[in-house]
Interface confidence: medium
Amino acid sequence: MEEGGDFDNYYGADNQSECEYTDWKSSGALIPAIYMLVFLLGTTGNGLVLWTVFRSSREKRRSADIFIASLAVADLTFVVTLPLWATYTYRDYDWPFGTFFCKLSSYLIFVNMYASVFCLTGLSFDRYLAIVRPVANARLRLRVSGAVATAVLWVLAALLAMPVMVLRTTGDLENTTKVQCYMDYSMVATVSSEWAWEVGLGVSSTTVGFVVPFTIMLTCYFFIAQTIAGHFRKERIEGLRKRRRLLSIIVVLVVTFALCWMPYHLVKTLYMLGSLLHWPCDFDLFLMNIFPYCTCISYVNSCLNPFLYAFFDPRFRQACTSMLCCGQSRCAGTSHSSSGEKSASYSSGHSQGPGPNMGKGGEQMHEKSIPYSQETLVVD
């Protein structure tokens, strides 16, 4: 309409570029049920991982163990909040737990996201050092370095998630009976800049919490695969089975991570781009409606990690079996592994006892014969 033109025949209807947004219809008990399942599997699985790691003697722990433990702690602290989110969703978005738990549980979602991603990146880098550069970087993989790296990643995760702790609040937004747990930008932003804050935080969380770590992980696994492929070309035919399994597990690790988190970050990014590119209404509405399910899938990652990072290790299975055995009959004494040593720690990066190429304390000696033969990713 032109400036100064009469708009008496304008009916007040938004033009077609504005969508017919509607209240999001929750899927009844589906999302709450998934949340509760993730809670049950996540607490059990991650608890088991922590038990397996910490029951081992300190000397037998490897640099990767600290990342494994951190990953389990991150997932565990997050999944314990899932009953709250299950309740919130089931009550059609009515938060009965107060502002403190709204802030805390929201904060833990993002701490978990960052810490998990950083732990996975740490693990990937640890594998890269173990397989691709075992001699040059042996010192980097000492437990002390792992502890420092873990401390840094936790501090970083805690800081990056801080805006959520600050901005999350509860409110009866319309003076109705329902209380929502939501992001309130009013304390840091003017009305006109609220969307900029939302976009800014959204873009930064996707960049720091997905794009950069995933790029690092892919790079690590690319070089790992290259090294393995190069080595196995010189090996006998029976090496092919190991190569396939090793590569397939690596692919499973990366792909699972991507499958769980990609939809969340992709949909979020597409939605934010919509304000610039003006998607068709149907697509915009589709993004809005699918986002809760994408969030749900990303939460599922917190219970999958124990299965992917632990259950691929036969020693972890052995530890689990010994625990179940001990739980039933006390195992007629201390549990022993088939090799005669005490059930060792679960490590996604190293074997547990000194192998043929191991030096003092189980660290690899400076001999690059078969550097990854100690990696527990090679499942016999």
């Epitope: 007040g12 209807a13 947004y21 009305v191 809005m288």
Partner: antibody
Framework: EVQLVESGGGLVQPGGSLRLSCAAS????????MSWVRQVPGKGLEWVAN????????YSVDSVKGRFTISRDNAKNSLYLQMNSLRAEDTAVYYC??????????????????????WGQGTTVTVSS | DIQMTQSPSSLSVSVGDRVTITCRAS??????LGWYQQKPGKAPKRLIY???SLQSGVPSRFSGSGSGTEFTLTISGLQPEDFATYYC?????????FGQGTKVEIK
């Protein structure tokens, strides 16, 4: 063309009843909250009541609670206002209006009311003995 | 209930003038305020929602600002068709409440 057409107004005695209807066209009626707003001749506007898309949530001003009932029939693209125990102060032009909300992408369940963007031409209700 | 107080209740202005109408809320309503224009015998029309967002199809000479309890509607360069009554509406909480209106008349 997006349109709302009210009907059912007229003259009624105090204590009497009246049912106002609003026929919607040109948009997906079932996707929107709907409101009734009234205006005493020569006076200001007063919001009366509104109803959620599926009818599961209804809100109204205290002065009409227990007397007026808002309802809808999505199959007929119609909004209704059942007015009982009418009083002289209920005399007004009654407008049917479409509510607009903004929805939080991240926080499902959070909605921001953006007022009424489409209005009908109004129907007059006169309560007099 | 939140009370909305509009000022002035009426004003006489000339075509081309800049008009400012103020609306005060009895308590903080964030940015949950809209502005409506009504001409005699016609239904109201939404001009502004969420304090400053312009309704599509509305000329850009209309603008809104404010936050919390004090809000303003500004018409920069009044046109003949802008002579009408203007209402503010708080859409922060139930019940929704309108201001008493500001009548803009020709001087």
């Amino acid at each position: 063309e997006v349109q709302l057409v009210e009907s059912g107004g007229g003259l009624v005695q105090p204590g009497g009843s009246l049912r106002l209807s609003c026929a919607a066209s040109g948009f997906t009626f079932s996707s929107f909250w709907m409101s009734w707003v009234r205006q005493v001749p020569g006076k200001g506007l007063e919001w009366v009541a509104n109803i959620k898309q599926d009818g599961s949530e209804k809100y109204s001003v205290d002065s009409v609670k227990g007397r007026f009932t808002i309802s809808r029939d999505n199959a007929k693209n119609s909004l209704y206002l059942q007015m009982n125990s009418l009083r002289a102060e209920d005399t007004a032009v009654y407008y049917c209006a479409r509510d607009r909300f903004g929805y939080s992408f991240y926080d499902k369940g959070v909605r921001y009311y953006y007022g009424m963007d489409v209005w009908g031409q109004g129907t007059t209700v006169t309560v007099s003995s | 209930d939140i009370q909305m107080t509009q000022s002035p209740s009426s004003l006489s202005v000339s075509v081309g003038d800049r008009v400012t109408i103020t609306c005060r809320a009895s308590q903080g309503i964030r940015n949950d305020l809209g502005w409506y224009q009504q001409k005699p015998g016609k239904a109201p029309k939404r001009l502004i929602y969420a304090t400053s967002s312009l309704q599509s199809g509305v000329p850009s000479r209309f603008s809104g600002s404010g936050s919390g309890t004090e809000f303003t509607l500004t018409i920069s360069g009044l046109q003949p068709e802008d002579f009408a009554t203007y209402y503010c509406l708080q859409h922060n909480s139930y019940p929704r409440t309108f201001g008493q209106g500001t009548k803009v008349e020709i001087k």
